[in-house]
């Protein structure tokens, strides 16, 4: 979706997700998600950022990594790895604070 | 339209712990648009956010309930869950659940007490 | 944290007058992301005002935002019985998320 003009300078980014209009995307910051979910193979999505910068600096877990870039088209060819399983005792968790 | 339903036990007895789980309908809860939150309001008073979750599972607490909130989300089933353990009677109040986007907060469930009592 | 702070407390008024309700911030609203929602007895919030000044969908055009950085103001610019309830400002859009403590409007 547009991002109002009040938002400040946006960038324009790859889209690589189920829920992308196209090929390209505008927002405040470029996004790469990378997710696994239980039983499945990790699945990278590449868009827009506007909201919760906060994510950009979670640690990665062996569920999900985020990554955050602020110029044009620069989640392009960006690859994401997820942490290896750790022991319980060590799992960092996904909340970033 | 996207709605939201909060669904859960109405009563916890104290030391327990209290789990809520919000449906989100007529939409997807994996649009990398939307983070879901948790809201609540004790008897009478203001709006406590407690915190969201992405649908990548990536979430953040309000930092006074941190230690005991756990936020999860299930996207085969639509769903987002909460989770607030050792609860008291501080706890009771309306728990809501709402979608957060650039478009602040623009739906909300319809909210679901919950009583600490034993 | 971003602490707000609305005033007054309490409006008095009477319908058709012009309402004006504000919301202050303890740290500049980043990309104004500062919404506004009404909330009547026994239901949830309704958003009014997003992005400090963007009107909801199916809000009507007597309710408007407006400000930047620290302050926020929302305007009825003339009441309806129906408008009388409480309303809450809210910082969004990063973490912590805050609401203020509330005004709330009441008929004179």
């Known amino acids: 979706d547009p991002v109002k003009p009040s938002r400040g300078p946006l960038v324009t980014c790859t889209c690589e997700s189920p829920h992308c209009k196209g090929p390209t995307c505008r927002g405040a910051w470029c996004t790469v998600v990378l997710v696994r979910e239980e039983g499945r193979h990790p699945q990278e999505h590449r868009g827009c950022g506007n909201l919760h910068r906060e994510l950009c600096r979670g640690r990665p877990t062996e569920f999900v990594n985020h990554y955050c870039c602020d110029s044009h088209l620069c989640n392009h060819n960006v690859s994401l790895v997820l942490e290896a399983t750790q022991p319980p005792s060590e799992q960092p968790g996904t909340d970033g604070q | 339209q996207v709605q939201l339903q909060e669904s859960g036990p109405g009563l916890v007895k104290p030391s327990q712990t209290l789990s809520l789980t919000c449906t989100v309908s007529?939409?997807?809860?994996?649009?990398?648009?939307?983070?879901w939150n948790w809201i609540r309001q004790h008897p009478g008073k203001g709006l406590e956010w407690i915190g969201y979750i992405y649908y990548s599972g990536s979430t953040y607490y309000n930092p006074s309930l941190k230690s005991r909130v756990t936020i999860s989300v299930d996207t085969s089933k639509n769903q987002f869950s909460l989770k607030l353990s050792s609860v008291t009677a501080a706890d009771t109040a309306v728990y809501y659940c709402?979608?957060?986007?650039?478009?602040?907060?623009?739906?909300w469930g319809q909210g679901t007490t919950v009583t600490v009592s034993s | 944290e971003n602490v707000l702070t609305q005033s007054p407390g309490t409006l008095s008024l009477s319908p058709g007058e012009r309402a004006t309700l504000s919301c202050r911030a303890s740290q500049s609203v980043s990309s104004n992301y500062l919404a506004w929602y009404q909330q009547k007895p026994g239901q949830a919030p309704r958003l009014l005002i997003y992005g400090a000044s963007s009107g909801a969908t199916g809000i009507p055009d007597r309710f408007s935002g407006s400000g930047s950085g620290t302050d926020f103001t929302l305007t009825i610019s003339r009441l309806e019985p129906e408008d009388f309830a409480v309303y809450y400002c809210q910082h969004y859009g990063s973490s912590p998320i805050t609401f203020g403590q509330g005004t709330r409007l009441e008929i004179k």
């Open positions: 007529g939409g997807s809860i994996s649009s990398n648009d939307y983070y």
């Open positions: 709402a979608r957060e986007s650039t478009d602040g907060m623009d739906v």
